[in-house]
Structures are given as C-alpha cells and as structure tokens.
C-alpha cells in the first residue's frame, strides 16, 4: 500500500539536491581558502538535520541553528551589498567588485542559492514531490525560514555605509513584503550602520526619470530615518555601463553620470 | 571515469587570440572548479585562473588579467579558455585542470594539454 | 604571491636509491602543499596531497612531509619508471604557484 504524501503547492526539492549542497562546498572552500577549516560532510549533515523528519510547516530557526554555526564567516562589515529583485546584477557586481559581498558570496548563501528543499514529518525522505509554497501552504518552510535566518545575520552583521540595490523596472521598487524589507532593513544595526544607500537599477534605456523619487523609495526612507540611520539614493541610469565602468573605472566615459 | 578532453593545437600569429576548450565527462560539469594551468616549453607549471561553471565565477591570476576569458557552457559540459594579443612568451602547453573529493585541493584530474605556437 | 623554492632543480640518482627534494613556501601554507610527477609530453600526475596524502594508486616509494613553510618529497627506492620532472605546488592561497620542478635523471 503507498503511503500518503503530502501535497504542497509548491516544487519539490531540487534533483541532486545533497550532492550540489556537498559540491558547493567543496568548490566554495577551494575557492575561498579562508574557509578551508569547514568540513563539508558535517555542514551537510547540519543542513540535512535542519528540515529531515520534521514537519515541512513548522520549521524554526532554532533548527537551522547547527548549520548557522558551522556556516560561521566574517566579512568586511562595511562591504556589504543587499538586494532586492535584482539578483543577478548584484551578483554581476561582487563578481566585478571583488572586495564587496552579497549573500550568496558566503558560504551558506551560496550552499542554497536557487535552490528548494524539504522533508516529511517522521520519515528520513527528502521530498522531491512538492514542497509548501510560502503564499499557498506555510511561511514556516525550510526554505523561507532558512532565507530568514541567514538574511537576519547578515544584516545584522553591516556597518558603516551599506548599500542596496533595487529593482527600477518593478511596480513596488522597495517591496515591504520582499526579504530585503521584511527582514534585512529591520535588522540593520543603528549603532553600527551610519548610512543606507540605495541603487535604483533603471531598466528602459530611455528612461530617466529620478526614481528615487518614487513613493515606495520615500516609504524605505522614513523606515530608515525612524531607526536611526541616514539614507541616501542613487539612479543607475545604465546597469551595463554602470558594470562596465566598475570594470574599468579610468575608462574617460565613466566620468559621467551612470 | 572522469575525462577532460582538450582541443587540437593550434598556431597563431603575435596579436592573434586563441580559444581552447576542455569537454568533461564523468561527473557533473557544475559540481566542480575548472582551472587553466600554462607550461611554457622546457619550463615550469604556472597556474592561470578557474571558473566555477555552475555560477559562470571566475578568478584569473593578475600576470594574465586583460588578456585571459575563462568561460563555461553548460550545455555542453565545456570549459574554454581564451587568451588575446598573443605574443611569443605564449607559445605554451595549456591544460585544464580538476581536484577530486579526496584529493585535498589538489589536481587528480587534467586534460591531455593543447600546445599553442605563436609565431609570426 | 607565495613563492615556492624548489630544490635541487635536477639530480641523478641510481636505481634503488633514496630520493628526496625539497620545497620552501616563502610564508605559511599549512600542510597545503601537492606533489606532482610529469613526464616528457604528459600532463602532470598527482602523487602527494596536503603534504603527505598518497592519491589514490600511488606506490608506498612516494612520500611526503612538512607543514607552514618547508616540506620534503621522498622516493624511498628509486625505480627506472620514476624518471620524470616533479613539481610542489601551494594550493593555501590564491594564486596557486608551483615550484620550479626537480628533474629525476638515473645515474
């Protein structure tokens, strides 16, 4: 007789699922000799008991407390880039910016990123089925929670000058609702953070209008203001000249605004 | 098995660029760091960068930086390595390069070598 | 850069003989050293890994030792198949860097 499963309205979890988490890290400690000291078997070990045999609903950040150990790393707290609805671009930076960090350019965001996981209550199974969806079933699943947790540390760990990039192209340019407002912004330190820059990504070539303007930008400012910290606002009117000109700062059309 | 085939050799003339490829078979292309090690003739290994392919990352040692591009495609489970305004110095043997799960961080794995001459 | 000073950069030895190179890292490099055996027209074979890690098939003739800055490769009973060029190289920081090879000659 086949057991029941569960049915959640969201993917299962990612095929291969614990070998990329072992092979990231194996490729993030090759890359990144600092980090040599982690044993990838037991940061595996800590994700997997984070959400095995556990209700895919009721998961904690206490459970992910293990890998969080494991996972320690520090970065320059003043070099830190946030993001929202702009991964890729974020990512295209730190790649060219090479002493600036994303999320996703430590350990553990990199472990996770892009991908989904869960488990079933009482069974060691790795659901490859379905797992819950964040809107449709539970915001308590492991990997919202698992989001929540290192994008808490995170913030929590900037200083000085943080900046964050912002998606110009999207109705919501800062999203209350998005990781980086319901999380990260909370979760500033007003004793170490002076100022919160953000970088309006435009995405229309002809589009220049000062977006930092906009009414959800003003919104982020005053919850910025309200805890003590300075806000400040760019446009990026041309994302690849702006790439461009980060690669290649001395070029004579970088002098101009971007 | 764990294979990395490398392209044919090839001549070029100075100024000329160059692009070598090495297709992996054996394991998952993503799951692993490509590296680019250079062996000029009658002379020692010199390390030149590495593509992490699942992420497109890449990292190029400063001698070689504005003159080296190391990319991957996915698709094809092939990493390429392209060197440009080739000069005389690099008429060399370049190899691709993999470490393995129980071998530290060094290489077990290695393609066969593409010699590249550059002469005018 | 890290600098690896390889020494001697050739020797001649004869067969059933002790072998043993050396390699200096210019700063600490923990136990983050390979060795690595390359014969004329072949592509580098690793022997040694973090130090003193025989890979996988290695014979028990090679060895390896050290940590921080100085390390040793040993070939206990040199064989007629053993003529090559071996290399150290650091893999602790980036860029990795090789030393600049020993050429094993039989006498």
């Known amino acids: 007789v086949p057991r029941w499963r569960q049915q959640w309205s969201g993917p299962g979890t990612t095929k291969r699922f614990p070998e990329t988490v072992l092979a990231r890290c194996v490729k993030y400690t090759e890359i990144h000799p600092e980090m040599r000291h982690v044993d990838c078997q037991s940061v595996w070990d800590a994700f997997k008991g984070a959400f095995i045999s556990k209700h895919p609903c009721n998961i904690t950040e206490e459970d992910y407390q293990p890998l969080m150990k494991l996972g320690t790393q520090t970065v320059p707290c003043n070099k830190i880039l946030l993001w929202s609805r702009i991964k890729d671009l974020a990512h295209q930076f730190t790649q060219v910016q090479r002493d600036m960090f994303t999320l996703e350019d430590t350990l553990l965001g990199y472990l996770a990123d892009d991908l989904t996981w869960c488990g079933e209550f009482n069974t060691s199974k790795i659901n490859y089925q379905s797992c819950p969806d964040w809107r449709k079933d539970c915001s308590n699943n492991p990997v919202s929670v698992f989001w929540k947790t290192v994008s808490r540390r995170f913030a929590e760990a900037a200083c000085d000058v943080v900046h964050v990039m912002l998606n110009g192209s999207r109705s919501k340019i800062f999203d209350k609702n998005s990781t980086f407002g319901s999380v990260e912004v909370h979760n500033l330190q007003p004793e170490k953070v002076q100022t919160l820059e953000a970088w309006v990504i435009h995405g229309g070539r002809e589009d220049s209008r000062d977006l930092c303007q906009d009414p959800t930008i003003k919104e982020l400012e005053s919850i910025i203001s309200k805890r003590n910290i300075q806000f400040s606002c760019k446009n990026i009117y041309r994302p690849d000249k702006f790439l461009q000109c980060v690669k290649n700062p001395e070029d004579s059309s970088c002098t101009s605004e971007i | 098995e764990v294979q990395l085939v490398q392209s044919g050799a090839e001549v070029k003339k100075p100024g000329a660029t160059v692009k070598i490829s090495c297709k992996v078979s054996g394991y998952t292309f993503t799951d692993s760091v490509m590296n680019w090690v250079q062996q000029g003739p009658g002379k020692g290994l010199e390390w030149m960068g590495w593509i992490d392919p699942e992420y497109g990352r890449t990292d190029v040692a400063e001698k070689f930086q504005g003159r080296v591009t190391i990319t991957a495609d996915t698709s094809t489970d092939t990493a390429y390595m392209e060197l440009s305004s080739l000069r005389s110095e690099d008429t060399a043997v370049y190899y691709c390069a993999r470490t393995g799960y129980q071998s530290g961080y060094g290489f077990p794995y290695w393609g066969q070598g593409t010699t590249v001459t550059v002469s005018s | 850069d890290i600098q690896m000073t390889q020494s001697p950069s050739s020797l001649s030895a004869s067969v059933g003989d002790r072998v043993t190179i050396t390699c200096k890292a210019s700063q600490n490099v923990d136990s983050d050293v390979d060795w690595y055996q390359q014969k004329p027209g072949k592509a580098p074979k690793l022997l040694i890994y973090k130090a003193s890690n025989r890979y996988t098939g290695v014979p028990s003739r090679f060895s390896g030792s050290g940590s921080g800055t100085d390390f040793t490769f040993t070939i206990s009973s040199l064989q007629p198949e053993d003529i090559a060029t071996y290399y150290c190289?650091?893999?602790?920081?980036?860029?990795?860097?090789f030393g600049g090879g020993t050429k094993v000659e039989i006498k």
């Open positions: 190289m650091q893999s602790n920081t980036h860029p990795r860097t």
